[in-house]
């Protein structure tokens, strides 16, 4: 078991000459925090999973209102580190998204409004235990530093905190078969502790917290005899005379999830699914209010002023969970009709129709596409007997064929800057705009032009598009 | 403006070490790292690592491990790389570069090394 | 290592044509990748960082696109001194790592 820190040491202007905006206004103040995500650096399944080793969300640092005129300094930052505990051993090598988001405090209709100003990622090497490790990056125009490490946390010690340390019991030496704690000359190493329970007769451990049990006995505690009788459904030839092989532990075994959170087992792992007021891997972290921004993907959270009192995330379409971690798979109501691709694009579902067919839902047949074809996913349109490609994102041309960049367009209204992200485009509004496309001016006195939001999104809530 | 001036062309015998730098100006030294890239000439680039002189922490590509060292100087803002144990594999052209872990925005024009008995 | 494998090798184009370079990496980069410009007998130039975002200096006739394993440069409106070799490198992961360049020359 370990944290993993993270310290922002400035977010600013990058180095070039020309000084971006100032994200803040006279009428617009705001505040910036920062959202760290990690994963496994080498797991296959790292790339697309969420952040498996976990996730930290900064306070909000002070309200900053620019100076008219002035060039936009180094932004004021949260105090304090991120940081995310991990249960198990540090992998060594990990991947890292950190996020700076703009909360902006003017007169919003429903609360603050937040925007994504930068992302930055990457995959490093680190040992426990070591030195800070500074780093510096780039996101459009700014410039983040930073700093990181990961600890262990006692009796934890070693480079992927796998190793127990405790306190000599005697002044000059180590117990039979134990060594002394290199760094730790005064400590010696212990033998690790197994899962509370793990019966000392009939399991053993590898890792703190396991528990695997020698042959004929099985059980999340290995206190339960593999069975003389008859078998059932054996899983396979036991090489125990005693009988049959029973199925090994479980990832759910023992319910790993803590705070009354409930497990599923995945196809590599378990996943928990937390009651309010806990998140984390395994609902260890707790005590958690709105301010702390415990709701992901542009939930809004309410209520919960006090760590007694439970928030709630109102998540936004295509996010599920106590804490709007969980992406809703809604194709696979299969809402596309003659073959269509579903696409759940979080924000909403889309069809990408077979040629010859058209519509929201792929429920239109097309005569005039008959035969024609448009690249790259596009879809033909009927047009008066003449056939048009509608394309894709990212692709356009009379038969989608040309690439294009989803920012060629112009897309952001009214002087915003596109950017396109992992999982889109992302429009940074000029300062009294507002909208995925900065479309809505913002009224003088505080009320917005902006239509009625769906359900858990507010106006201002950045919101993407592939 | 920031510049970074490398050391002249060098001509070693095999199994000999060299030593090149990179003096840097304009900018405060310390708030940008360093990096080493190695291009033969008519072919590709090659990063060796880089140097943070914030700390001397070095990031190196295995490759280069034991190879080149890399060091700096903070008093005169001089990044240097030496290579040990030459061959005429490491007769190339040496460039440094100021940037962060990721982008590499300003280059020095670079250093021939040339390695013959 | 990520492997990044750039084409085409080698093209020509007239002055005012549209040029694209492309880069692919072995694996998702997450927009980590910049795109650099090396001029005869001269040290490579920044032209593009982060995907998509371009140096201040450059011309506003370059720009990059893509995500995930796929980039592309385009440089709309060639003109005489673009007339150079353009490597592509990914920075997600040590050792960054460069494409093996694309050479351009005017027809």
């Known amino acids: 078991a370990g944290v993993f820190e993270l310290q922002i040491h400035s977010f600013g202007p990058g180095p070039g000459p020309g000084a971006p905006r100032s994200p803040c206004s006279a009428r617009l103040p705001c505040r910036l925090f920062f959202r760290v995500c990690l994963k496994p650096g080498l797991s296959e399944e790292a790339a697309e999973s969420p952040c498996a080793l976990g996730a930290a969300l900064s306070a909000r640092g002070p309200v900053y209102t620019e100076q008219p005129g002035a060039p936009a300094p180094d932004l004021p930052l949260p105090d304090g580190l991120l940081q995310v505990p991990f249960r198990d051993a540090w992998p060594g090598t990990f991947s890292f998204i950190i996020e700076t988001w703009r909360e902006e405090l003017g007169d919003q209709i429903g609360g603050p409004a937040w925007s994504l100003l930068a992302r930055v990622a990457g995959r490093r090497r680190l040992a426990a235990g070591g030195p800070w490790a500074r780093d510096i990056q780039r996101a459009g125009a700014w410039e983040l530093r930073f700093s990181y490490r990961a600890r262990c946390e006692p009796p934890a010690v070693g480079t992927a905190c796998t190793r127990l340390c405790r306190p000599r019991s005697a002044p000059s030496r180590c117990g039979p078969g134990l060594r002394p704690c290199a760094p730790l000359e005064d400590e010696c190493e212990a033998p690790l502790v197994c899962r509370a329970g793990c019966s000392p007769e009939h399991g053993f451990c590898e890792q703190p917290g396991e528990c695997r049990c020698l042959e004929g006995w099985t059980g999340p505690l290995c206190t339960v005899p593999v069975s003389t009788s008859s078998c059932l459904s054996p899983r396979g030839p036991s090489s125990a005379t005693t009988g049959c092989l029973v199925p090994g532990p479980g990832p759910c075994d023992g319910n790993p999830c803590a705070n009354g959170g409930s497990c599923s087992e995945t196809p590599r792992s378990f996943e928990c699914t937390c009651p309010r007021g806990f998140y984390g891997l395994r609902c260890e972290v707790s005590g958690v209010t709105c301010a702390d921004g415990p709701c992901f993907n542009g939930g809004l959270c309410v209520g919960g002023a006090d760590p007694d009192s439970a928030y709630i995330c109102h998540c936004p379409p295509g996010f599920q969970g106590s804490n709007c971690e969980k992406r809703v798979d809604r194709c696979s109501l299969q809402p596309c009709r003659n073959g269509g691709l579903c696409l759940d694009l979080g924000h909403a579902l889309r069809c990408r129709c077979r040629a010859g067919f058209a519509g929201p839902r792929c429920e239109h047949d097309l005569d005039d596409c008959a035969g024609r074809a448009c690249a790259n996913g596009g879809t033909c349109v009927e047009g008066g007997g003449a056939h048009r490609c509608s394309c894709a994102l990212g692709f356009g041309g009379r038969d989608c064929r040309e690439r294009a960049d989803p920012c060629a367009a112009r897309p952001c209204a009214h002087g915003g800057r596109c950017y396109a992200h992992f999982s889109g485009l992302v429009c940074a509004c000029a300062p009294g705009y507002m909208g995925a496309r900065c479309e809505f001016p913002v009224h003088p006195d505080g009320a917005s032009a902006l239509p009625a939001a769906p359900p858990g999104l507010r106006p201002g809530d950045p919101q993407r598009y592939l | 403006q920031v510049q970074l001036q490398q050391s002249g062309p060098d001509l070693v015998k095999p199994g000999a070490s060299v030593k090149m730098s990179c003096e840097a100006s304009g900018y405060t030294f310390t708030a940008y790292f360093i990096h080493w890239v190695k291009q033969k000439p008519g072919q590709g680039l090659e990063w060796i690592g880089y140097?943070?002189?914030?700390?001397?922490?070095?990031n190196y590509n295995v490759k280069f491990k034991g190879k080149a060292t890399l060091t700096s100087d903070t008093s005169s803002s001089i990044a240097y790389m030496e290579l040990s144990s030459l061959t005429s594999e490491d007769s190339s052209f040496y460039y440094c570069?100021?940037?962060?872990?990721?982008?590499?925005?300003?280059w020095g024009h670079g250093t021939t090394l040339t390695v013959s008995s | 290592d990520i492997q990044m494998t750039q084409s085409p090798a080698s093209l020509a184009a007239s002055v005012g044509e549209t040029v694209t370079i492309t880069c692919r990496a072995s694996?998702?980069?997450?927009?980590?990748l910049a795109w650099y410009q090396q001029k005869q007998g001269k040290s490579p130039q920044l032209l593009i960082y982060?995907?998509?975002s371009l140096e201040d200096g450059v011309p506003s006739r370059f720009s990059g696109s893509g995500s995930g394993t796929q980039y592309s440069m385009k440089i709309n409106n060639m003109q005489p001194e673009d007339t150079a070799t353009y490597f592509c490198k990914q920075a997600y992961d040590v050792p960054l790592t460069f494409g093996a360049g694309t050479k351009l020359e005017l027809k």
């Open positions: 982060n995907a998509n």
């Open positions: 140097i943070d002189p914030f700390n001397d922490d070095t």
């Open positions: 570069a100021r940037g962060t872990s990721a982008t590499l925005d300003y």
């Open positions: 694996e998702n980069i997450y927009y980590s």
